[in-house]
């Protein structure tokens, strides 16, 4: 048993038919000796007496707010939640698998620039009930400092006949250089309480690879005199890392005709222009990375070539 | 990546087209190992990462863009040890933090020069004979290093008279190509940086 | 049978302060997150403020460091300490645990508790 916060308390369980539990401990935080009785939630049934209380957790229905009492006032309470491990593994009921970019993968992170600003998000087909905690630090055996806001409902999708939450936390390492090479990975620890039932859920990464560029803005077609030419332009996103001739990009423009099916031209370029032929109906698209460290593409920003 | 690689002007900074060859040349060597040594701890996520030239030079620091002199968080340690002039410094202009950084630059690739001779030299003895240093990018080292032109002591290469342990040598190749592979990085950033100054 | 009654509304200035109190049976409280809903006349029904489990809390932007939630787990009640009371927080105010409303798909709301914030 451990402490999660203020009179919160996890009791971690083996979880499989007929597991004996763990024997718990409470003690009731209080100078009084006599005349102490335990009750369990709203029930007014005394579960002993005494300054504490021996208890056998198996199930949920152990879970729940243990509270000592004397003469009908209460002199302090702690809520036990379960942690479950099953065939030694701990549960994963709360968060759903992403499975990108592999298996087991409940937190997803980016960041837009190498401010040492990232996100982080999650899935879960639970609606109410549920309470997350977000915590974050530079290396794990000599922790630095970064701060997580609080983790908020920031999507909500309808896949099949199920509703699927998008839970998401921005975070800021406190003193972060940009140009710095990382040599330790950021940890970022979530812990999820849905009822009684606490798990907790980690990731680690570099900064250089979550990177993910806005797209690129300002994008505009010039038509080239007698050609079916166009001049592309665009500029790096705002949120990119300055100066701009340190942290480079590279884009991919692409030529994308009406269908799907029409053949794509595409042309890498480390400039923010490119000329390219226009077809009727079709769109011209353009995506950024780094130039030297090749983590994710940026979305397309698109313009139509008419 | 497959991109279309644009050749320099001749008037260009002279070493970027050689760091950029730099960065080619130990992505795909580090690629190469990380197929190869499929069974060994060699990605991102499984290696310790270790910086050789850590404390010996400070290339990071020395080589910071001017616009990040004001973020606190990048002026931790700033040393200014290094002082000598090299043929890719533009002229007079040159300030003396730019000499600073290149020749930081230099010593770094000088000792990763030796420590993969090292370690190719142990590789070959491998009865497996699995994975050697592509000589390709030994060859790009050497030729950035002669681009910088800095006259420096040459360090004699390490030999061991132990019977080599390969499975810790293609450990240890694994590390220190991640490592060079994200200063090979900053160094392409730091060219890109001063040919646009 | 889920039984929720809520009290303590009534008329105040603005500026004034009130304590609401939602006493909750029928269901096992502690595990559930427990909110505090109001009703303006003609408009939707919408959450204030809730506690969760964990004595997590979250509050509307409209309230937010003027009202505070707080639940008690062995008498099954939840408050709202609401200060700084302005007009446009007149409504009809309902305690719930969104939870059960989704488990069980049935709506089960109190009476509510009127707050009226006047001059």
């Known amino acids: 048993i451990w402490e999660l916060k203020k009179d919160v308390y996890v009791v971690e369980l083996d979880w499989y038919p007929d597991a004996p539990g763990e024997m718990v401990v409470l003690t009731c935080d209080t100078p009084e000796e006599d005349g102490i009785t335990w009750t369990l939630d709203q029930s007014s049934e005394v579960l002993g007496s005494g300054k504490t209380l021996t208890i056998q957790v198996k199930e949920f229905g152990d879970a729940g707010q243990y509270t000592c009492h004397k003469g009908g006032e209460v002199l302090s309470h702690s809520l036990l939640l379960l942690h479950k491990k099953e065939d030694g593994i701990w549960s994963t009921d709360i968060l759903k698998d992403q499975k990108e970019p592999k298996n087991k993968t409940f937190l997803r992170c980016e960041a837009k620039n190498y401010s040492g600003r990232f996100t982080c998000w999650w899935l879960t087909t639970i609606s109410t009930d549920l309470t997350f905690s977000v915590k974050s630090s530079r290396g794990s055996s000599d922790p630095q400092g970064v701060t997580c806001g609080a983790a908020t409902l920031s999507a909500e999708r309808v896949r099949g006949d199920n509703k699927e939450y998008e839970y998401s936390v921005e975070c800021q390492e406190d003193s972060a250089c940009p140009a710095a090479e990382e040599s330790l990975p950021i940890e970022v620890m979530v812990d999820a309480v849905h009822k009684l039932k606490y798990e907790n859920y980690t990731s680690s990464f570099f900064i250089r690879d979550i990177i993910k560029p806005d797209p690129p803005k300002n994008l505009q077609l010039k038509p080239l005199k007698n050609s079916r030419q166009v001049e592309v332009s665009w500029e790096y996103p705002d949120t990119w890392s300055t100066p701009h001739s340190y942290f480079s990009l590279t884009f991919c423009v692409q030529v994308q005709g009406k269908s799907k099916r029409e053949k794509k031209d595409r042309v890498f370029t480390d400039k923010t222009s490119a000329t390219v032929i226009c077809r009727k109906n079709a769109s011209i698209s353009v995506r950024a990375q780094d130039r030297y460290y090749s983590s994710s593409w940026s979305e397309w920003a698109s313009v139509p070539c008419s | 990546r497959n991109l279309p690689v644009a050749t320099p002007d001749p008037g260009m900074f002279p070493c970027l087209h050689h760091s950029q060859n730099l960065l080619r040349a130990v992505s795909n060597m580090l690629q190469k190992a990380r197929q190869t040594l499929e069974f060994y701890p060699c990605t991102s996520e499984e290696i310790d990462h270790e910086d050789i030239t850590k404390d010996k030079t400070s290339t990071v620091e020395a080589c910071l863009p001017l616009e990040l002199t004001k973020n606190e968080s990048c002026l931790n340690s700033r040393e200014t040890s290094f002082i000598t002039n090299g043929s890719c410094l533009a002229s007079r202009k040159t300030s003396f933090m730019m000499a600073l950084c290149l020749s930081s630059i230099y010593e770094d690739l000088k000792m990763y020069q030796v420590e993969f001779k090292t370690m190719n030299a142990k590789l070959l003895m491998d009865p497996k004979r699995q994975i050697f240093l592509d000589q390709n990018m030994l060859a790009v080292i050497d030729e950035l290093m002669q681009a910088l032109n800095f006259n420096s002591e040459t360090v004699p290469q390490k030999s061991s008279l132990e019977e080599p342990d390969f499975y810790k040598t293609k450990i240890k190749l694994c590390i220190l190509l991640h490592a060079f592979r994200i200063r090979a990085v900053t160094i392409d950033r730091v060219m890109s940086y001063l040919n646009a100054s | 049978e889920v039984q929720l009654v809520e009290s303590g509304g009534g008329l105040v200035h603005p500026g004034g302060s009130l304590r609401l109190s939602c006493v909750a049976s029928?269901?096992?409280?502690?595990?559930?997150?427990m909110g505090w809903y109001r009703q303006a006349p003609g408009k939707q029904r919408e959450l204030v403020a809730s506690?969760?489990?964990?004595?997590?809390?979250n509050y509307a932007d409209s309230v937010k460091g003027r009202f505070t939630v707080s639940r008690d787990n062995v008498k099954g009640t939840v408050s709202l300490q609401m200060n700084s009371l302005k007009p446009e927080d007149t409504a009809v105010y309902y305690c719930?645990?969104?939870?059960?409303?989704?488990?069980?798909?049935?709506?089960?709301w109190g009476q509510g508790t009127q707050v009226t914030v006047s001059s």
């Open positions: 506690i969760s489990s964990v004595y997590s809390t």
């Open positions: 719930n645990a969104p939870g059960l409303l989704h488990e069980e798909g049935t709506d089960y």
């Open positions: 029928g269901f096992r409280f502690t595990p559930y997150t």
